[in-house]
């Protein structure tokens, strides 16, 4: 007869490992007992259990409550055992020794491999701002046995760098994703993908990219200067900008307070029926947590009653900004 086993048994941490040992004998042969032991080099044989055809299963104290026979029905020639709740320390070589009658003793070895699935963590980098050079967007770390694979899934252009730290029974892999921040990246997902033989499916952790920026401010509403005449109703100036986070708007008049009746509604400055008192320099101030910008325009309200030959100033606009 001969012993049937596996060269390698693979189990995920916390699961039960079946250690196979089956005697395929000729008819009439019997198995008297099966002895299981750790057979790691340098450790000496550490007994796990003794399976006796007459007296049943005896488990050594070190493995009390952890070694069982597979559930019935059981073949008397089957010396397999279950090792409950596998831990990393269980990884190694095991030996089964089978005493048969009348053929004598047989032995076989197998290697138990305990997979430790990773619990990945994603750490976003510092707040991203337009104008920065190559910047860390996020790092992703996963530790397991064997070493996990860490990759990135994103439509954003960037560079990755990985490093690995080996521990006694596991390895930690860290991958970093670097990019040059651009407003076009706002809202784009950056996903860390961790693969490992102990996982049923890849682990994914997603970070949404946010790049702070503030666009130049400009003012709309003065395109046709001739519309800005005394008595006109519904005149308004609108401040245009874009930003992340969304900017807030504020209107002031450079050469004095805002005239009475002028309404500020966010980015819009609404005028009552125009008078010459509405002439002046108006400043739109745009700001967010990242920066602030100004845009100023000169409003010149025409009075048809006055000298029609009067020279009208062209609309002037200027921009200023500062970074917080």
């Amino acid at each position: 007869g001969e012993l049937e086993t596996s060269d390698v048994v693979t189990v995920v941490l916390g699961q039960d490992a079946k250690l196979p040992c089956f005697y395929r004998g000729d008819s009439g042969e019997q198995v008297g007992q099966v002895a299981w032991a750790r057979a790691d080099a340098g450790e000496g044989a550490q007994e796990l259990a003794l399976l006796h055809s007459k007296y049943g299963l005896h488990v050594s104290p070190a493995y009390e409550g952890r070694v069982e026979q597979p559930p019935p029905p059981r073949n008397p020639l089957d010396g397999s055992v279950l090792l409950r709740n596998a831990v990393q320390a269980d990884e190694g070589e095991y030996e089964c020794r089978v005493s048969t009658f009348p053929a004598g003793s047989f032995q076989a070895r197998l290697r138990l491999r305990v997979l430790v699935p990773p619990l990945p963590s994603l750490n976003p980098g510092p707040a991203l701002e337009e104008g920065q050079g190559l910047t860390l967007a996020a790092s992703c770390t996963a530790e397991g046995s064997p070493a996990p694979s860490v990759t990135w899934d994103t439509e954003v252009k960037g560079t990755t760098s990985s490093r690995s730290f080996k521990h006694s029974r596991s390895a930690a892999v860290t991958s970093e994703f670097h990019l040059v921040p651009s407003r076009s990246m706002n809202g784009q997902p950056l996903t860390c993908v961790v693969s490992h033989p102990g996982l049923l499916q890849d682990q994914r952790i997603t970070h949404i990219l946010h790049v702070s920026f503030l666009a130049e401010a400009s003012v709309r509403g003065l395109e046709d200067q001739n519309l800005w005449h005394v008595g006109r109703e519904g005149a308004m100036l609108k401040c245009l900008s874009e930003g992340q986070p969304p900017p807030s708007y504020n209107w002031t008049r450079l050469d004095g307070p805002l005239p009475s009746g002028v309404r500020v509604d966010g980015d819009t400055l609404g005028f009552p029926p125009l008078t010459t008192e509405h002439s002046g320099i108006y400043v739109c101030h745009v700001s967010n947590e990242f920066s602030s910008r100004d845009s100023q325009v000169t409003v010149d309200v025409l009075d048809p009653q006055e000298d029609s030959g009067k020279q009208v100033d062209l609309v002037s606009a200027s921009h200023h900004h500062h970074h917080h």
């Epitope: 510092p126 707040a127 809202g187 952790i205 970070h207 949404i208 946010h210």
Partner: antibody
Framework: QVQLQESGPGLVKPSETLSLTCTVS????????WSWIRQPPGKGLEWIGY???????NYNPSLKSRVTISVDMSKNQFSLRLSSVTAADTAVYYC??????????????????WGRGTLVTVSS | QSVLTQPPSVSAAPGQKVTISCSGS????????VSWYQQFPGTAPKLLIY???KRPSGIPDRFSGSKSGTSATLGITGLQTGDEADYYC????????????FGGGTKLTVLG
């Protein structure tokens, strides 16, 4: 002040595509993220996905294969398309404005403005 | 089954205080800001609390929010019959099914 209004057919046949539009009035669509959220009758809220004014999108993974969100800056509108609908897609669909920013330590994300919602029934 | 767990219902008498819990994990509440929404029957939800504990203008200070670890709480003091509504918590979740997640909602009943 800024207001959102959903529009689109209230009845869609199974296997067809649901199409809705959200019109933003009283303010600009720029600088913000914009989301679609739905609520089946008598049930809770489910986020469908968002679009940034520049066009970048992100969708609920459970709906990703069927969802498209697009934006039309010139019309101050954004739209939802949900393909291959079934009765399970019957819901009130809301459009919402997101405040959405990562401050270097955590996500600041909330829906500060909502449309009134529109009921879409999937039935033959 | 919602990623964020809320009690289906809570109730209290007018004038009393009530709290609504919202329980999550490290991939959502634990690492991100939480917001709360109030919804009356037949109407759209309304932002009640953002950034864990801030109130938008127009929301009375009877409403408060807090966060600790992987749980968030909405508190309402001086309960009024007009507070009877559904309340939802929400936050970003970065895990496998990444996206915005809402709690299942809590129906607040004002007794009497």
């Amino acid at each position: 002040q800024v207001q959102l209004q959903e529009s689109g057919p209230g009845l869609v046949k199974p296997s067809e595509t649901l199409s809705l539009t959200c019109t933003v009035s009283g303010g600009s669509i720029s600088s913000y993220f914009w989301s679609w959220i739905r609520q089946p009758p008598g049930k809770g809220l489910e986020w469908i996905g968002y679009i940034y004014y520049s066009g970048n999108t992100n969708y609920n993974p459970s709906l990703k294969s069927r969802v498209t969100i697009s934006v039309d800056m010139s019309k101050n509108q954004f739209s939802l398309r949900l393909s291959s609908v079934t009765a399970a897609d019957t819901a009130v669909y809301y459009c919402a404005r997101d405040f959405h920013h990562y401050d270097g330590s955590a996500y600041r994300w909330y829906f500060d403005l909502w449309g009134r919602g529109t009921l879409v029934t999937v039935s033959s | 089954q919602s990623v964020l767990t809320q009690p289906p219902s809570v109730s209290a008498a007018p004038g009393q205080k009530v709290t609504i819990s919202c329980s999550g994990s490290s991939s959502n509440i634990g690492n991100n800001y939480v917001s709360w929404y109030q919804q009356f029957p037949g109407t759209a939800p309304k932002l009640l609390i953002y950034d864990n504990n801030k109130r938008p203008s127009g929301i009375p200070d009877r409403f408060s929010g807090s966060k600790s670890g992987t749980s968030a709480t909405l508190g309402i003091t001086g309960l009024q019959t007009g507070d009877e509504a559904d309340y939802y918590c929400g936050t970003w979740d970065s895990s496998l099914n990444a996206g915005w997640v809402f709690g299942g909602g809590t129906k607040l009943t004002v007794l009497g």
